[in-house]
Amino acid sequence: AGLKLMGAPVKLTVSQGQPVKLNCSVEGMEEPDIQWVKDGAVVQNLDQLYIPVSEQHWIGFLSLKSVERSDAGRYWCQVEDGGETEISQPVWLTVEGVPFFTVEPKDLAVPPNAPFQLSCEAVGPPEPVTIVWWRGTTKIGGPAPSPSVLNVTGVTQSTMFSCEAHNLKGLASSRTATVHLQLVPRGSSAHHHHHHHHSAWSHPQFEK
């Protein structure tokens, strides 16, 4: 009966680790029991209160102390009025931060000079995310768009590889993958006269 949850849909972008206060204005009801909902689930946060602006106008706040990626989503507030649930326009919260790895290079065991591949993928927001590859402390490729595959033609000793993901918020380093040499049985036809590394860096869609 005349209940209004004020405010237009909002898109809010916040940096990871920063606080955010969402607010919700309710008019036409004394003492509303304001609930916050994220992606359909009620947000439990008992230290949240509401502010009376006037007897029939209240503002509810949802305080997030330090946002992380899992806080991103669609938020709205709701109140019950005469058995009916009224919901507000949503707030879309985007949490930006340094890239987050979805695929990191894995440890491998390969024969000497055998070719192999390592994969790396990272996401934002913000996008785009670019990848740089490292062998030990030497940069060996990039930057180029994520995801990426490093094609290595072979190694003759245990070697460490890692990737680095960059976006506008900064950079993140992946785990370090160790590529071990598989012991080759005596009498095998493996060639041992190559003593240098070859590596090729490529974006998956350009793989041959």
Epitope: D33, L46, D47, L49, I51, P52, L64, K65, S66, E68
Partner: antibody, heavy 125, light 108 residues
Framework: EVQLVQSGADVKKPGASLTISCQAS????????ISWVRQKPGKGLEWMGQ????????HYGPSFQGHVTISADRSTATAYLQWRSLEASDTAMYYC??????????????????WGPGTLVTVSS | SYELTQPPSVSVSPGQTARITCSGD??????AYWYQQKSGQAPVLVIY???KRISGIPERFSGSSSGTMATLTISGAQVEDEADYYC???????????FGGGTKLTVL
Amino acid sequence: EVQLVQSGADVKKPGASLTISCQASGYTFTDYWISWVRQKPGKGLEWMGQIRGPASATHYGPSFQGHVTISADRSTATAYLQWRSLEASDTAMYYCVRHQQQTSGGTIPEYYQHWGPGTLVTVSS
Amino acid sequence: SYELTQPPSVSVSPGQTARITCSGDALPKKYAYWYQQKSGQAPVLVIYEDKKRISGIPERFSGSSSGTMATLTISGAQVEDEADYYCYSTSTGGNYMVFGGGTKLTVL
């Protein structure tokens, strides 16, 4: 001036029931956001639970769930803490706490709390 | 159930800086509140949302939070600051509140 008036000290036997009260005055808005806090003699503070909003939504601390009931009467601006069966370990001071946020002209909330003077409950055979 | 851990006691001389810590797994995501309780009195809220000072509380009281640790700092502690101090925060799931065990501040 904001005031929380709590009921007087009480002495009960184990197994007895008891309800203590906390009446608020001096508020423009009866927003019923009240917590109860226990403090055993010489010990620290323990959050028991909270009642909030006109729907009287209640939340309890894990140690108090099922042992006490928190309620409120909007018409008299009074919150209640009730036991069905007291135990000797319930001997303590019980505080009610009124939570309030308000704005000073803008939309940035300031936070206030008002504590009642406490009700001493003694449970002894 | 969720716990907040405080040192049982802290002692400082008048004019020194007192630091009282509170640790809890949810503190990176949940705000800390600080209470002062003097002997025989009801507690008084001094700091809310980690670092905001309640109106009327002296400026020597400040709060901070980093990771799983919240800290109440009293810069230039005075004899009248001698009290028990409690931190308070929300449980990990946000569905109940918790007090720390309390720290007795002695200003010798």
